[in-house]
Interface confidence: medium
């Protein structure tokens, strides 16, 4: 990804004053309303055949300050007699995120945005079997 | 919801006021670098015992304007003969993500967070059996 | 999957002209800004030129204004940029690249394509 300058459709928006002056409202929030916020934590990490973690991710400077990361419990899936199935592997899915962070003292409060790319749970699959030549 | 500082370093920075004017630098984007912006899609949604299908969720005034959400194939898991498991289904694993959404007609650019749900991947799990009472 | 493809790039005397092309593919091309951006040997990226959806509008840095002209065509999902009166500073790789709403922000370019100015 980069970042360049460039003229801008707004008139007299200097590109280097653009990148550092960006202006976020941060009244409006949730796009889908309450059924955002008010989700229960699923139970899927324990009842998966692929069961997961989470383990949390807290950094004050950051919004959302915790993260919660998944990391899978077997590098095997767990079959119907609740044992490690070794066809079959645990693989986590990742997803991009947008966070804020805090730039370090800084009057009034500034943000930068980063990417990140966290675990949201596992799933099964099967094992890839390489053939010899 | 909202982000506010909580407990000020800096002096006479009010709530109200702060909310509307954060000021976001955008020079900074990738936290991991390159193992963000380079990685490849992952052929996992087809693999896995309970694949997904990605459907294109396309917005120019969002940042990221395209997001993939997940929906699961089926509603039970695929078994090793490759067969429907009416024992087991396949479930959606979601994540709450940030995107920047560009206030109308905005110079200089102002934007706005907006908390989205989205679907990532699926998982598999045990069916969940009601005993009569 | 996004894919951006550019073409038209090679060897020219300073003075002469060039043609290049993008073509785009995995999303909704009109939709987006487009932009050329370059990168000269041991140099970092520089904006080129921009265009509106609708073709409507364009921008230039300074140094390319009056010789080099960016236009496209979105029924055939491309992007163009017509080079005139090339000189040796404009040596570079030539990135055909889609804007986001953050009008200084890429996630997407493509491959590249040379474009060496000299006698």
């Known amino acids: 990804a980069a970042i360049i300058p460039q003229s801008s459709a707004c008139p007299n928006t200097e590109a280097k004053d653009f990148l550092q002056n960006v202006k976020v409202n941060l009244k409006v929030f949730n796009s889908l309303g309450a059924k955002v916020s008010s989700r229960r934590p699923s139970d899927y990490l324990n009842r998966s055949t692929s069961p997961w973690t989470l383990h949390r991710n807290e950094d004050p400077d950051r919004y959302p300050s915790v993260i919660w990361e998944a990391q899978c419990r077997h590098q095997r899936c767990v079959n119907a007699e609740g044992k490690l199935d070794h066809h079959m592997n645990s693989v986590l899915i990742q997803q991009e995120i947008l966070v804020l962070k805090r730039e370090p003292e800084s009057c009034p409060f500034t943000f930068r945005v980063e990417k990140m790319l966290v675990g949201v749970g596992c799933t099964c699959v099967a094992s890839i079997v390489r053939q010899a030549a | 919801a909202a982000i506010i500082p909580q407990s000020s370093a800096c002096p006479n920075t009010e709530a109200k006021d702060f909310l509307q004017n954060v000021k976001v630098n955008l020079k900074v984007f990738n936290s991991l670098g390159a193992k963000v912006s380079s990685r490849r899609p992952s052929d996992y949604l087809n693999r896995s015992t309970s694949p997904w299908t990605l459907h294109r969720n396309e917005d120019p005034d969002r940042y990221p304007s395209v997001i993939w959400e997940a929906q699961c194939r089926h509603q039970r898991c695929v078994n090793a003969e490759g067969k429907l498991d009416h024992h087991m289904n396949s479930v959606l694993i979601q994540q709450e993500i940030l995107v920047l959404k560009r206030e109308p007609e905005s110079c200089p650019f102002t934007f706005r967070v907006e908390k989205m749900l989205v679907g990532v991947g699926c998982t598999c799990v045990a069916s969940i059996v009601r005993q009569a009472a | 999957e996004v894919q951006l493809v550019e073409s038209g790039g090679g060897l020219v005397q300073p003075g002469g002209s060039l043609r290049l092309s993008c073509a785009a593919s995995?999303?909704?091309?009109?939709?987006?800004?487009m932009y050329w951006v370059r990168q000269a040997p041991g140099k970092g990226l520089e904006w080129v030129a921009s265009?509106?959806?609708?073709?409507?509008?364009?921008y230039y840095v300074d140094s390319v204004k009056g010789r080099f002209t960016i236009s496209r065509d979105n029924a055939k999902k491309s992007l163009f940029l017509q080079m005139n009166s090339l000189r040796a500073e404009d040596t570079a790789v030539y990135y055909c690249?889609?804007?986001?709403?953050?009008?200084?922000?890429?996630?997407?370019w493509g491959q590249g394509t040379l474009v060496t100015v000299s006698s």
């Open positions: 995995g999303f909704t091309f009109s939709s987006y800004r």
């Open positions: 690249a889609k804007g986001e709403i953050l009008p200084l922000y890429f996630d997407y």
């Open positions: 265009i509106e959806q609708d073709g409507s509008e364009e």
